[in-house]
């Protein structure tokens, strides 16, 4: 028969014959022959291959370096890489999460719109009229101004985006 020029899925062409690729989690040791199938062996500890392949070396699992603020979110297997995330209060600097930076705090006048996660920074928003934030915080939202009316008080000092209103007693009507 004519030697093949193309092979099926999960096969590769070598020496005019189709050999099976190695399954995820295994590496290639030797191509198939007319007598034996492709020889594949498992990746070692701390190694992985995540696709059907003909790689002769497995990839090393990612190292989550605590010196860079990283910790393991999901331990790698022979078929998957380790997933790193950042320690509490830190977030990844990139999608690959190779290092971490401290979560940003929202300055007075700004509140937290979205609390940071291990992979995303704090999102701040300016406090709109009627709201304020007087602290620098990575957690605090803008607080609404105190409603003096509900306390039977009147506004003595208007609020800003950084300060609450100051309420005081209502002036008595003079006779």
């Amino acid at each position: 028969p004519e030697p093949p020029t193309a092979c099926r899925e999960k096969q590769y062409l070598i020496n005019s014959q189709c050999c099976s690729l190695c399954q995820p989690g295994q590496k290639l040791v030797s191509d198939c022959t007319e007598f034996t199938e492709t020889e594949c062996l498992p990746c070692g500890e701390s190694e992985f291959l995540d696709t059907w392949n003909r790689e002769t070396h497995c990839h090393q699992h990612k190292y989550c370096d605590p010196n860079l603020g990283l910790r393991v979110q999901q331990k790698g297997t022979s078929e998957t890489d380790t997933i790193c995330t950042c320690e509490e209060g830190w977030h990844c600097t990139s999608e690959a999460c190779e290092s971490c930076v401290l979560h940003r705090s929202c300055s007075p006048g700004f509140g937290v719109k979205q609390i940071a996660t291990g992979v995303s920074d704090t999102i701040c928003e300016p406090c709109p009229v009627g709201f304020f934030s007087n602290v620098s915080s990575a957690f605090e939202k803008c607080h609404p101004w105190t409603s003096c009316e509900t306390k039977d008080l009147v506004v003595q000092q208007a609020g800003t985006n950084k300060t609450d209103v100051v309420c005081g007693p209502q002036d008595r009507l003079r006779a």
């Epitope: 030797s30 191509d31 020889e39 498992p42 002769t56």
Partner: antibody, heavy 115, light 110 residues
């Protein structure tokens, strides 16, 4: 069809080194590992180590670590196994074989260590 | 001292079946489906007859079969023939790019 042809018999003095060659033909040389196995007279098979199909990375049995060196010359499709600090108990037939599975074997090389 | 344990000898009459065991540990035979069996006639290089626990290279008769249970692999030669008289060795992958052999079994056809 892969064929492995080994170098001829050697007689060595204790303390010296021996270098056995294994020339491959057929197939793609860089696409299969080569294991080395030895067999002392009247004894069983003993795996010594292997050299990776690409890049020449090696893995040696603990027993031979520090005494064995496996190399390859891609230009001549030849793999070499060098054993140093020879002792009489290293007298054996040394085989090269394809892969860990060892589906093809060389004819063997007798190494005699004697003073 | 071999890493895998085989009986030193086994025997059977022509036409009979004989089984050879190969016992390892949970780090080699038990851990991987990478057990091979070799036949070696005196003065010859070994020949692969079984790989990946139970697969036969093409050209090896189906009289040779093999299996694995736990840390023990077994080779069965059925319909024994005079030419089956030889030494038989098992091997197993042991992780970290290492391989281990059994001590070998001398099969005698009575």
């Amino acid at each position: 069809q892969v064929q492995l042809v080994q170098s001829g018999a050697e007689v060595k003095k204790p303390g010296s080194s021996v270098k056995v060659s294994c020339k491959a033909s057929g197939g793609t040389f860089s696409s299969y590992a080569i294991s080395w196995v030895r067999q002392a007279p009247g004894q069983g098979l003993e795996w010594m180590g292997m050299i990776n199909p690409s890049g020449g990375t090696t893995s040696y049995a603990q027993k031979f670590q520090g005494r064995v060196t496996m190399t390859r010359d891609t230009s001549t499709s030849t793999v070499y196994m060098e054993l140093s600090s020879l002792r009489p108990e290293d007298t054996a037939v040394y085989y090269c074989a394809r892969g860990f599975r060892m589906d093809q074997w060389g004819q063997g090389t007798l190494v005699t260590v004697s003073s | 001292q071999s890493a895998l344990t085989q009986p030193p000898s086994a025997s059977g009459s022509p036409g009979q079946s004989v089984t050879i065991s190969c016992t390892g540990t949970s780090s080699d035979v038990g851990a991987y489906n990478f057990v091979s069996w070799y036949q070696q006639h005196p003065g010859n290089a070994p020949k692969l007859i079984i790989y990946d626990v139970r697969k036969r290279p093409s050209g090896i008769p189906d009289r040779f079969s093999a299996s694995k249970s736990g840390n023990t692999a077994s080779l069965t030669v059925s319909g024994l023939q005079a030419d089956d008289e030889a030494d038989y060795y098992c091997s197993s992958y042991a992780g970290n790019n290492r391989l281990v052999f059994g001590g070998g079994t001398k099969l005698t056809v009575l």
